[in-house]
Structure formats: C-alpha cells, structure tokens
C-alpha cells in the first residue's frame, strides 16, 4: 500500500536552515535571498511508530535522492546519518525503526525523537555551519527544536 | 466499542473458492488497515493480507496468486476470496483491524470462523 | 521468507518472572508486538511497538527488543496467564508470525 508523503524544509528555532555538507552529512546555517535555495527538501513519510494527538512517527528523505536520516550505534553511541537504500523499495508504510522519528508538536514547534533511541533527539549546534546530529539532550544548549515548512510538490 | 463480525461457508471440497466476509462495527472505517489471519488447528498463525478503505492491498507472497481481498466501504466490510482450496487451507480463519494507535496492528479481533476442506 | 523463531513452550511457576523470546534476522532494527491466545479463542494484542501496553493489558506484561532477539516478560505470573504467545514482525512487505509459544503456569 502506498505511503502518504509531503514535501517540506526544516530550520531550527534560531531559523537556521539544513544544507548538504558532503555526500552523507547535513548542517545547519543561515541562509538569505537566492541562497535559500541550497537548503534541502525533505520527503516526510508517515509511517509505522507510536501515534498519538502530537506524535506522529515519520521518516525523512531527501526529496528525489535514495538518502534517508537514520540512526545507529557508531562506537556505542547513536548517531544520526544519510543511509542510501534501494529506491524501488523505499518509502513504505513499514519502516525499519532506524529510519523513524518521533514527530513531537509542543507549541507550534517540532521536535523529532529517535524511534530507535528513545530520547535522542535530530538535533543542531548553535554555532554556525556545524553537521546536523543525535543529541541526547533537550533544553541544553544544542537545539531540538524546529519548524517546518512545506513545498508544492 | 469495536465489534467484527465475520462469516462464510464452513465447509468446502478441494479446487473450491473460499469466501468469507467481515463487518465491522463502530469506530471509523477508513482510518484503519482490515486484515485476514488464518490458523490451522492445532498449529500457529499464518498473515494473509490486509486492505485499506481504497482498496490498496499487502498479501502474504506464499498466497499471492490465490488471494483476493476487497472492500465495500459502504457497508464497512471487507471480504477474503481463497481460490483452489485444499486440505492444506482447514484453517480458522480470522478478520482483524490494524490501528496506527497500536502502530498498525492487529488491535481488534473477529470470532474466527473454523473453513473444513474435505472431499 | 522471513523466519521467526520461539520456544515451543516454557513453564513457570506462579508468582515467578516468565520470559518468552522471539529470535529473527535483525529483529531489533523492526517493531515486534506479542499476542496471547487462549483455548478456543481469538488472540488478543499484549505488547505492541517493542514495549508498548495495549489499555487493559496488566502491567506485568512487558517488552523489550534489541539486537536479533524481542522478548516477553510476565513478571508475577497468574494461572490465567497460561495461555499460546505469538510474537510478530514485518517482513518486507508482509507480517509474520512466530510459531507460538505454549506457557504453562504450574500447580
């Protein structure tokens, strides 16, 4: 059965913007004018996971690329990544729990919870022009808190 | 409170078709996964496959080329049709609801209606 | 096909911690639910999304899933807790369903 998908950006709530950095990595900077256009489009998938009123379990893809954020133990500690899988086969309904995140609204902002690693969160730095990572804190100083913005298909 | 009821000739001979149906009471119907299980008696569960309300389908490959699920949103219920029977197909088969609550499982059960395939 | 794998029976005696394991080719990396069935009746979901209780399922149920093995836990088990357990996974694009597990609870 098909998976229900949406087109959307995500800046972080100091509005900083997710670009590519390398093939497998994302960061995280400001961006203006013209620039913007670097940023990625992700293709959110609504998928198996917990579900509730303001969860939502979803995957994140790179729009027309066969990469999705994932989450894995790199030297005992769960990191999040690009994963290339096999584009005949992806999105489904019925995700592997590495690809899923927790979608979480609490006022009018979105936090996405590692499905895997329950309280791990996609997470960025406050500084500028850093990867995009699994931070296992919320409220410190790196930034789990996003805003979403959708793009026509 | 949910409620599925299900129904459907008991008793078959091989190369028969079998049809059971499945209604489902209260809840929504379009919100949901309807699925068919089936047991051998004595023996474990075995997944046939699922439906949606617009008919989109997941079958278990072993049963492909038998299977045939459906569905008539206007009267919530969904049907299993088994073709070429054997003796291999006595079973009691099940209809069941996948919920996204339950992270689209089997949350609601029907009675189970026990199919004899005999010559 | 996918393939997984439980004991075909364990035995506990009441008021004891009973485990029922559940082993498949990278079962971690995917949501495992449990369902007990009882003689002549239609199973009932026990454990859903690795670790997850279903309203009305006791807290003695519990879950975990890592690495190939997902496991059951019924902590202080009851006589009425003897019953066939099945635990259940994706598969690819199919779900799949252990061979069951008969728990005898005993005296």
């Known amino acids: 059965a098909p998976v229900r998908s949406l087109n959307c950006t995500l800046r972080d709530s100091q509005q900083k913007s997710l670009v590519m950095s390398g093939p497998y990595e994302l960061k995280a900077l400001h961006l203006q004018g013209q620039d913007m256009e670097q940023q990625v489009v992700f293709s959110m998938s609504f998928v198996q996971g917990e579900e509730s009123n303001d969860k939502i379990p979803v995957a994140l893809g790179l729009k027309e690329k066969n990469l999705y954020l994932s989450c894995v133990l790199k030297d005992d500690k769960p990191t999040l990544q690009l994963e290339s899988v096999d584009p005949k086969n992806y999105p489904k309904k019925k995700m592997e729990k590495r690809f899923v995140f927790n979608k979480i609204e609490i006022n009018n902002k979105l936090e996405f919870e590692s499905a895997q690693f329950p309280n791990w969160y996609i997470s960025t730095s406050q500084a500028e022009n850093m990867p995009v990572f699994l931070g296992g804190t919320k409220g410190g100083q790196d930034i789990t808190d996003f805003t979403m913005q959708f793009v026509s298909s | 409170q949910v409620q599925l009821q299900q129904w459907g000739a008991g008793l078959l001979k091989p190369s028969e078709t079998l049809s059971l149906t499945c209604a489902v009471y209260?809840?929504?119907?379009?919100?949901?996964?309807w699925s068919w299980i089936r047991q051998p008696p004595g023996k474990g569960l075995e997944w046939i496959g699922e439906?949606?309300?617009?008919?989109?389908?997941n079958y278990n490959p072993s049963l492909k080329s038998r299977v045939t699920i459906s569905v008539d949103t206007s009267r919530n219920q969904f049907s299993l049709s088994l073709s070429s029977v054997t003796a291999a197909d006595t079973a009691v088969y099940y209809c069941?609801?996948?919920?996204?609550?339950?992270?689209?499982?089997?949350?609601?059960w029907g009675q189970g209606t026990l199919v004899t395939v005999s010559s | 096909q996918s393939v997984l794998t439980q004991p075909p029976s364990v035995s506990v005696s009441p008021g004891q911690t009973a485990s029922i394991t559940c082993s498949g080719d990278?079962?971690?990396?995917?949501?495992a639910f449990w369902y007990q069935q009882k003689p002549g009746q239609s199973p009932v979901l026990v454990i859903y999304?690795?670790?997850k209780r279903p309203s009305g399922i006791p807290e003695r149920f519990s879950g975990s899933n890592s690495g190939n093995t997902a496991t059951l836990t019924i902590s202080g088990t009851q006589a009425l807790d003897e019953a066939d357990y099945y635990c259940?996974?994706?598969?690819?694009?199919?779900?799949?369903f252990g061979g069951g597990t008969k728990l005898t609870v005993l005296g």
């Open positions: 069941a609801r996948a919920s996204p609550s339950s992270g689209w499982t089997l949350d609601y």
């Open positions: 209260g809840g929504s119907f379009s919100d949901y996964y």
């Open positions: 439906i949606d309300h617009s008919g989109s389908t």
């Open positions: 990278k079962l971690g990396d995917k949501f």
């Open positions: 999304l690795d670790n």
């Open positions: 259940q996974a994706w598969a690819d694009s199919f779900e799949v």
